[in-house]
């Protein structure tokens, strides 16, 4: 009787089962969330899982469907989208992906009043952007880089602009560069809020520097691949923003915007637009030397039909000890009295926090405050203001959503999910419906990801909308690792880390550490998430410790850490890499002769820098398509860093910090280089250099390539990638197979 | 299941107005957004008023500022008062959800403008 619980406790264990490399592969323990796709204060469509699109109303508790699965796959629709006024609806096909964000496709409109696809006058195929207009059903689209618009879905197109040509002139849609580092989206075009006016961008890329490499094929001969792509002190785009009136397009046709003269002094990025009201426009712009940045707000002028923005409102932001802004320059948030706005910006702690400015930056009026930053303010409605930070329990690598009255004196702040699930939900992000009269909760860990919907008054959950529970059955019986998240103290600087153990994991054995790193600025890897992934089953199955460090240049814990790597890109990245190995063979758990690092993109440049640091600490280690030199890469992304690589600029860095410069380092380690040779973002030049640099030094060293795989290493790459680095390391850590 | 009935059609000089009515019955009530639509003689029916659970209304252009959508939930009805009529609002005049679903449309009611 006393040994029965005993055994029925051991035979429970013995059904666990270890993570397999076949179960991260083919996605078996992979989570939903649910974003609505609000269309109203109170109303959402979501496509259901047999593919209908269904309209929910969350007042009346009824829920139909307005577009059946059976008119979706007449015409193979994997996307749609509504016209607000309710008629129309558009429905994607033949997507085709370009670059990171862009991606072709074939549009077709379906008429909901009259249950039929509608004939005539049909787009063109296939097309780079479409979209509704706010109120209505207008169209805006972008054909081979021009932009036409139609007053209705049946209507003849009226052609906005005439001059776009293929990698030259770009139109409502961005060039490669602006695409990946400055916009984040695969349009540039924006209706005004009652679409009245349309503005756009047209990105001038006639005398930008190509990058031309081979793509393989099944032909007889590769095809070459031309992108107009700005390295690092290359000549830019040339960018002007238009805008035109919707209703009269041929009156005076687009008008020009102009550009803050402190600005147009010099080289400049236009970085974004804010529509506040029809005839207020806001702009944002950058000096190439990306310290300056200026926000513009614009008015229309009846009288000439042109757009004015006067200096005095102008208002300028300026980082002294590093870059303006985080990644991006953050984007205004406007108020009702449509002038005054909300935005995120450094405090004189050196904190990112959200400030109110009325008249001028300098009278900005902080609504945050304290030790941890401000990350996303997700609406301003005319009584609260809602927004994420890692303020609580001071863990940087959290999220919480939180409500600021901003109706009653003095302002009262409310932490609106601190406390909903706090085991199972330490980061959130939200989507709000208009008014915000409901939200949606996402809740992505560090338990099984769960989506919530709520009252925006009162903040109470009314339904969930997504809770995993097939993945939470899935999981109970898999001997997941275990997670912890905590900080090392060294030198005055805070090193979060994540560790992530073997599920037996006895702190008095030995066990191989891997070093998973990214490390770029503003990135964060420490973050309160659930993941079931590669590490995840290396940790699981095959017993190995596993280690994510945010070392200096890293975000959301302030400027001294996050512009500690101004201008010196390589250096202390790594550095708080080996710290923190350092400190974690010190906690005794480690096998100090079974030590790796792997690392991709920016990580595989700081993986390449750590195993040449001649520290010996590493054993071995894995750089996938890493950069390895700054002069390779973008522009945008690499200058706001470093500055220009001119000897009166920061030239000297720009050499000192490439992997090849250390190329005799790696003899004493076991490096395995990866890298697609169709990799647009990090050009396999930047590996094509190292090879060449080891070569030379005759040293030895693994690699492989996949043949016309970009920066992400998608589909079947993945599991050869995955299977290949996994054998590398169990061969690295005398692991049996 | 569900029934839409409209009501309050008919011949009026150009300038007048009509108020219509649409009695909604079966499963869905009168709360969820709903629309006016009107097709008229040879052309595509089309979107005229719609009115969010909300109260949030959205117009066709060319009724903006004379027509007006409301609804009784009591009543569980829904309306379009019509005003400043043009010969060119002559149609048939039904309601639905809005957006419409296929299934939902009733027989309508008729409004012609004599000028």
């Known amino acids: 009787i006393v040994l029965r619980p005993s055994r029925v406790h051991n035979s429970e264990e013995n059904t666990m089962r270890a993570l397999t490399l076949k179960d991260i592969l083919n996605g078996t323990f992979s989570y939903k969330t649910f974003f609505p796709n609000w269309i109203s204060g109170q109303e959402y469509l979501h496509q259901s899982a047999d593919n209908n699109i269904v309209l929910y109303n969350i007042e009346t508790g009824q829920s139909y469907t307005i577009l059946s699965n059976r008119t979706m796959k007449s015409v193979n629709a994997s996307n749609y989208g509504l016209s607000p006024d309710r008629q129309f609806v558009y429905l994607e096909s033949d997507y085709s992906k370009l670059w990171r964000y862009s991606y072709t496709a074939t549009y077709y409109i379906y008429d909901l009043s009259n249950g039929e696809f509608v004939r005539g006058n049909e787009l063109p195929r296939p097309i780079q952007y479409l979209c509704w207009s706010p109120v209505g059903s207008k169209l805006a689209y972008v054909y081979q880089n021009n932009i036409y618009l139609k007053q209705r879905p049946g209507d003849p197109p009226f052609q906005i602009t005439f001059n776009g040509r293929e990698n030259k002139i770009f139109n409502g849609i961005p060039d490669w560069v602006y695409e990946e580092e400055m916009l984040a989206t695969k349009y540039a075009l924006w209706w005004s809020p009652n679409g009245k006016f349309l503005a756009y961008a047209e990105f001038n890329d006639t005398d930008i520097p190509v990058i031309a490499y081979s793509y393989y094929g099944d032909e007889q001969y590769p095809r070459t691949i031309n992108i107009p792509y700005p390295k690092a002190g290359a000549k830019n785009p040339v960018v002007r923003i238009f805008i035109i009136d919707t209703t009269y397009p041929a009156y005076v046709g687009p008008q020009e915007v102009p550009v803050p003269a402190m600005i147009a002094s010099s080289d400049y990025y236009f970085s974004w637009l804010t529509w506040v009201t029809d005839e207020r426009v806001c702009l944002q712009w950058l000096k190439r030397v990306q310290n300056v940045s200026v926000l513009s707000i614009c008015d229309f002028r009846e009288d000439w039909q042109t757009w004015d923005c006067p200096k005095t409102q102008e208002h300028i932001e300026e980082s002294r000890t590093g870059w303006a802004g985080g990644f991006f320059v953050s984007t205004p948030v406007f108020s009702y009295d449509a002038i005054s706005y909300y935005k995120i910006f450094s405090d004189k702690d050196g904190y990112k926090h959200i400030h109110y400015i009325k008249d001028t930056v300098e009278n900005a009026i902080q609504i945050t405050s304290g030790k941890w930053e401000a990350i996303n303010i997700f609406r301003v409605t005319q009584d609260s203001l809602f927004y994420s930070s890692n303020e609580f329990e001071e863990y940087p690598g959290r999220r919480n959503i939180y409500r600021i009255s901003i109706g009653s004196y003095p302002p009262s702040k409310k932490c609106v999910t601190c406390h909903l699930r706090k085991e199972r939900c330490q980061y959130y992000t939200a989507s709000f419906s208009d008014y915000a009269k409901y939200y949606a909760l996402v809740c992505y860990g560090p338990g099984i990801p769960i989506s919530t919907l709520h009252d925006g008054r009162t903040d109470q959950e009314i339904k969930i909308l997504e809770e995993n529970k097939e993945l939470e059955n899935a999981l109970k019986n898999i001997q997941l690792p275990k997670e912890e998240i905590k900080k090392l103290e060294v030198d005055e600087i805070t090193l979060w880390y994540k560790m992530i153990l073997p599920p037996q994991f006895d702190r008095s054995k030995k066990y191989p550490l891997l070093i998973q790193v990214y490390g770029g600025p503003c990135s964060q890897s420490v973050r309160s998430v659930f993941a079931v992934n590669w590490i995840s089953y290396l940790a699981s199955k095959e017993g190995m410790v596993i280690a994510l460090v945010d070392g200096r240049g890293t975000a959301f814990q302030g400027d001294k850490l996050l512009y500690a790597v101004y201008r010196k890109l390589g250096v202390y990245e790594v550095e708080d890499q080996i710290t923190a190995v350092r400190k974690f063979i010190e906690m005794g758990f480690i096998d100090e002769k079974r030590i790796a690092i792997w690392g991709w993109s920016y990580g595989g440049y700081v993986s390449s820098l750590a195993l040449a640091s001649g520290t010996g600490l590493f054993k071995c280690g894995i750089a996938v398509a890493p950069v390895s030199s700054w002069e390779y890469y973008a522009s945008v992304y690499t200058e706001r860093f470093m500055g220009l690589p001119t000897k009166d600029d920061n030239l000297e860095h720009y050499k000192n910090s490439t992997v090849m410069a250390r190329a005799e380092y790696f003899r004493n380690v076991d490096y395995l280089l990866i890298h697609g040779t169709a990799d647009d973002n990090v050009h396999f030049q930047n590996s094509a250099q190292i090879a060449k640099a080891l070569v030379n030094a005759q040293v030895d060293f693994q690699a492989m390539w996949y043949s016309d795989q970009n920066h992400g290493l998608s589909g079947l790459s993945t599991n050869h990638l995955y299977t290949h680095m996994t054998h590398f390391l169990k061969q690295c850590f005398s692991l049996s197979d | 299941d569900v029934q839409l009935v409209e009501s309050g059609g008919g011949l009026v000089q150009a300038g007048g107005s009509l108020r219509l009515s649409c009695a909604v019955s079966?499963?869905?009530?009168?709360?969820?957004?709903m629309g006016w639509y009107r097709q008229a003689p040879g052309k595509q029916r089309d979107v005229v008023a719609g009115?969010?659970?909300?109260?949030?209304?959205h117009y066709a252009d060319s009724v903006k500022g004379r027509f007006t959508i409301s609804r009784d939930n009591a009543k569980n009805t829904v309306y379009l008062q019509m005003n400043s009529l043009k010969a060119e609002d002559t149609a048939v005049y039904y309601c639905?959800?809005?957006?419409?679903?296929?299934?939902?449309w009733g027989q309508g009611t008729q409004v012609t403008v004599s000028s």
């Open positions: 079966g499963s869905i009530s009168s709360a969820n957004s």
């Open positions: 009115l969010t659970t909300g109260g949030r209304s």
């Open positions: 639905n959800l809005w957006p419409p679903v296929q299934g939902y």
